[in-house]
Interface confidence: low
């Protein structure tokens, strides 16, 4: 239904607090380098304007689209050309090209300083002095570093952030109360950002059909008792929500997400028996809870899939009449029966089924041609099962840090052209699959592991797309969304890679390493490991282990020394020489 003033409509639907927060997120995700104060000023101007439109929807400019209003506002930033370079050229365009242009300039890896957490007392004072500014700053800092963060979910994080400070700044031991909560929010936030980035990549790089297929599979696993028509309706609505958020239409996205949560709760009897608790919560918590809800139990006595999709003489007729609907039904039926499969595996099976029908329905005897289609699924199912089994065994044997190191070596040999920070970040995250998923029973391992790996490999793909350096990464990232993980798994050592020249500076360390946290120290060591492999791609596991053991002993020794800096200088030279000898450099 058309509204005379879109901005007034969204302001009334969302309320002033959410309206202001979402506009701030939108602006910070577009102009990631702008100072906080500039964004607050822009948001206040937009809010004041929205209020005039609420009072009189016929007032001047109130009929303009949100893209026009927001784009015009962003283009008033005086330093746009100096700060953003060619992004300023977006302002010469008309909508919708201008918004598309802003979207294309979103930076997944902005050159922003690391967020350093101040002392607890300092944070609590800032929180008490001006709670509103403190929380806005949180939204701003997260949004500019994560330009695709799911905006309505960020409101939920901000609510939890506020609750943590409200509770802990009154506690006897503020730090003991607050720090674990902030760590949890940080880790959950990074995971949420990465999951959403995959949804946006799916929509933007592979199109709506790819996203809808993903949603059919996931929702069918989660709501196996729901009818196909019900799942289809949820998929359509969910696709709209994510298309809006990924397209920068955050007000519409938040509004539509609230409507979807409302619909799900009003119709939970025909959707899932697991929604009751979620639906009793306030809006932000409710939406989050629904998104994370556990899979409902499978209906008893589901008939064999073969009857409708292999044995029936009407397979080709049904397929020809409505290809996507028929394939959607296949995916729905397969997914609801297989909560033990990853979504990407289900999508591979559906693709295999589609390819078979495309070929066979044009054959002389279609039924004879597709009769054995389910046999083709067996190797597709076994491949991730075997891979997860092997890697979980390795994880249990090595522990997380050494498992990450094994993956660092593996991936550096596959794609040595990728920058060292990216290889470290991605391999560390790949390695976390062990502690995240290997503890699960067999039936939950694959959906946990392979769908998590899809999220992590998408991080590699979006970081690599910014400055591509490897044809192999480009190929695995762009050819097929669902085959990314098998594509990377299948890569062998890159024999065309010319080893990096040995640079002693890369392996020079100083006393500051001693004051780093355990995590930061691990990252330093893992960075050195990647550089070693880039210098000596053919180094054996044993050679690399020997050098890394020497390195760990060297750091431990020098951090205990009285004159740490001299120790690092003297012993460091010896370490570099010994490493070169050990690796035959």
């Amino acid at each position: 239904d058309a509204h005379k003033s879109e901005v007034a409509h969204r302001f009334k639907d969302l309320g002033e607090e959410n309206f202001k927060a979402l506009v701030l997120i939108a602006f910070a995700q577009y102009l990631q380098q702008c100072p906080f104060e500039d964004h607050v000023k822009l948001v206040n101007e937009v809010t004041e304007f929205a209020k005039t439109c609420v009072a009189d929807e016929s007032a001047e400019n109130c009929d303009k689209s949100l893209h026009t209003l927001f784009g015009d506002k962003l283009c008033t930033v005086a330093t746009l050309r100096e700060t953003y370079g060619e992004m300023a050229d977006c302002c010469a365009k008309q909508e919708p090209e201008r918004n598309e242009c802003f979207l294309q300039h979103k930076d997944d890896n902005p050159n922003l300083p690391r967020l350093v957490r101040p002392e607890v007392d300092v944070m609590c004072t800032a929180f008490h002095d001006n709670e509103e500014t403190f929380l806005k700053k949180y939204l701003y800092e997260i949004a500019r570093r994560h330009p695709y963060f799911y905006a309505p979910e960020l409101l939920f994080f901000a609510k939890r952030y506020k609750a943590a400070f409200t509770e802990c700044c009154q506690a006897a031991d503020k730090a003991a109360c607050l720090l674990p909560k902030l760590d949890e929010l940080r880790d959950e936030g990074k995971a949420s950002s990465a999951k959403q980035r995959l949804k946006c990549a799916s929509l933007q790089k592979f199109g709506e059909r790819a996203f809808k297929a993903w949603a059919v599979a996931r929702l069918s696993q989660r709501f196996p008792k729901a009818e196909f028509a019900e799942v289809s309706k949820l998929v359509t609505d969910l696709t709209k929500v994510h298309t809006e958020c990924c397209h920068g239409d955050l007000l519409e996205c938040a509004d539509d997400r609230a409507d979807l949560a409302k619909y799900i709760c009003e119709n939970q009897d025909s959707i899932s028996s697991k929604l009751k608790e979620c639906c009793e919560k306030p809006l932000l918590e409710k939406s989050h809870c629904i998104a994370e809800v556990e899979n409902d139990e499978m209906p008893a006595d589901l008939p064999s899939l073969a009857a409708d999709f292999v044995e029936s003489k009407d397979v080709c007729k049904n397929y020809a009449e409505a290809k996507d609907v028929f394939l959607g039904m296949f995916l729905y039926e397969y997914a609801r029966r297989h909560p033990d499969y990853s979504v990407v595996l289900l999508l591979r099976l559906a693709k295999t089924y589609e390819t078979t029908l495309e070929k066979c329905c044009a054959a002389a005897d279609p039924h004879e041609c597709y009769a054995k289609v389910f046999d083709e699924f067996k190797p597709l199912v076994e491949e991730p099962q075997n891979l997860i089994k092997q890697n979980c065994e390795l994880f249990e044997q090595l522990g997380e840090y050494k498992f990450q190191n094994a993956l660092l070596v593996r991936y550096t040999k596959k794609v040595p052209q990728v920058s060292t920070p990216t290889l470290v970040e991605v391999s560390r995250n790949l390695g976390k699959v062990g502690s995240k998923c290997c503890k699960h029973p067999e039936a939950k391992r694959m959906p946990c592991a392979e769908d998590y790996l899809s999220v992590v490999l998408n991080q590699l793909c979006v970081l690599h797309e910014k400055t591509p350096v490897s044809d192999r990464v480009t190929k695995c990232c762009t050819e097929s969304l669902v085959n990314r993980r098998p594509c990377f798994s299948a890569l062998e050592v890159d024999e065309t890679y010319v080893p990096k020249e040995f640079n002693a500076e890369t392996f020079t360390f100083h006393a500051d390493i001693c004051t780093l946290s355990e995590k930061e120290r691990q990252i330093k060591k893992q960075t050195a490991l990647v550089e070693l492999v880039k210098h000596k791609p053919k180094a054996t596991k044993e050679q690399l282990k020997a050098v890394m053991d020497d390195f760990a002993a060297f750091v431990e020794k020098c951090c205990k020394a009285d004159d740490k800096e001299t120790c690092f200088a003297e012993e460091g030279k010896k370490l570099v020489a010994a490493s070169q000898a050990a690796l035959g450099l």
């Epitope: 294309q104 350096v469 044809d471 480009t474």
Partner: antibody, heavy 120, light 110 residues
Framework: EVQLVESGGGLVQPGGSLRLSCAAS????????MYWVRQAPGKGLEWVSV????????YYADSVKGRFTISRDNAKNTLYLQMNNLKSEDTAVYYC?????????????WGQGTQVTVSS | QPVLNQPPSVSGSPGQKFTISCTGS????????VNWYQHLPGTAPKLLIY???KRASGVPDRFSGSKSGTSASLTITELQAEDEADYYC???????????FGGGTRLTVL
């Protein structure tokens, strides 16, 4: 056979603008990074700009940043270079070149070039 | 001033073996592929060698490329009269986020 045909060059006064086009054929245009490279009289080759397959990523030489804009229309198989605030040192033959699937790939095919002269 | 350094000119006799050097830094040649181009006056430049060592299609096997650390070189065995041209090396530069060329080497066949 890969073909790249530049057009849009000519004589222009300092401070003026020109828009170069490069019509591509004989390959899947939308799959390749595309470049502009120029050669000033008596000088060597100088990279000007590059654009990725979708048009979402663009890079520019410092000498043209803020004045030149590279763009592409994959539906029309055409690469563009919008040149504003032209200076006499922009005088050169401008070549359009087909890159690889990644930014660091070699420039496998070049157009014949179009002359741009900036003079009062 | 070009980012990659090449000798401005070299000359040789037919049948000779010839090498043109190209020196850069870790942000370009050190961490990226090197490509070589041949440019004859009045024509479009032509890709000779890509990804350090691979010959572009149609390039005779008299031309070869190599890379070591932050330097690269183009070698022409059995120099021929038609090899007289300008030769450019090129690489992506991570710190400049751009493509860099050498200043070019004019090869004269005596």
């Amino acid at each position: 056979e890969v073909q790249l045909v530049e057009s849009g060059g000519g004589l222009v006064q300092p401070g003026g603008s020109l828009r170069l086009s490069c019509a591509a054929s004989g390959f899947t245009f939308s799959s390749y990074w595309m470049y502009w490279v120029r050669q000033a009289p008596g000088k060597g080759l100088e990279w000007v700009s590059v654009i990725n397959t979708s048009g979402g990523s663009t890079y520019y030489a410092d000498s043209v940043k803020g004045r030149f804009t590279i763009s592409r229309d994959n539906a029309k198989n055409t690469l563009y270079l919008q040149m504003n605030n032209l200076k006499s040192e922009d005088t050169a033959v401008y070549y359009c070149a087909k890159g690889g699937l990644v930014v660091a790939g070699g420039l496998g095919s070049w157009g014949q070039g179009t002359q741009v002269t900036v003079s009062s | 001033q070009p980012v990659l350094n090449q000798p401005p000119s070299v000359s040789g006799s037919p049948g000779q073996k010839f090498t043109i050097s190209c020196t850069g830094s870790s942000s370009n040649i050190g961490d990226n592929y090197v490509n070589w181009y041949q440019h004859l006056p009045g024509t479009a430049p032509k890709l000779l060698i890509y990804d350090n060592t691979k010959r572009a299609s149609g390039v005779p096997d008299r031309f070869s490329g190599s890379k070591s650390g932050t330097s690269a070189s183009l070698t022409i065995t059995e120099l021929q009269a038609e090899d007289e041209a300008d030769y450019y090396c090129s690489s992506w530069d991570d710190s400049l986020s751009g493509l860099v060329f050498g200043g070019g080497t004019r090869l004269t066949v005596l």
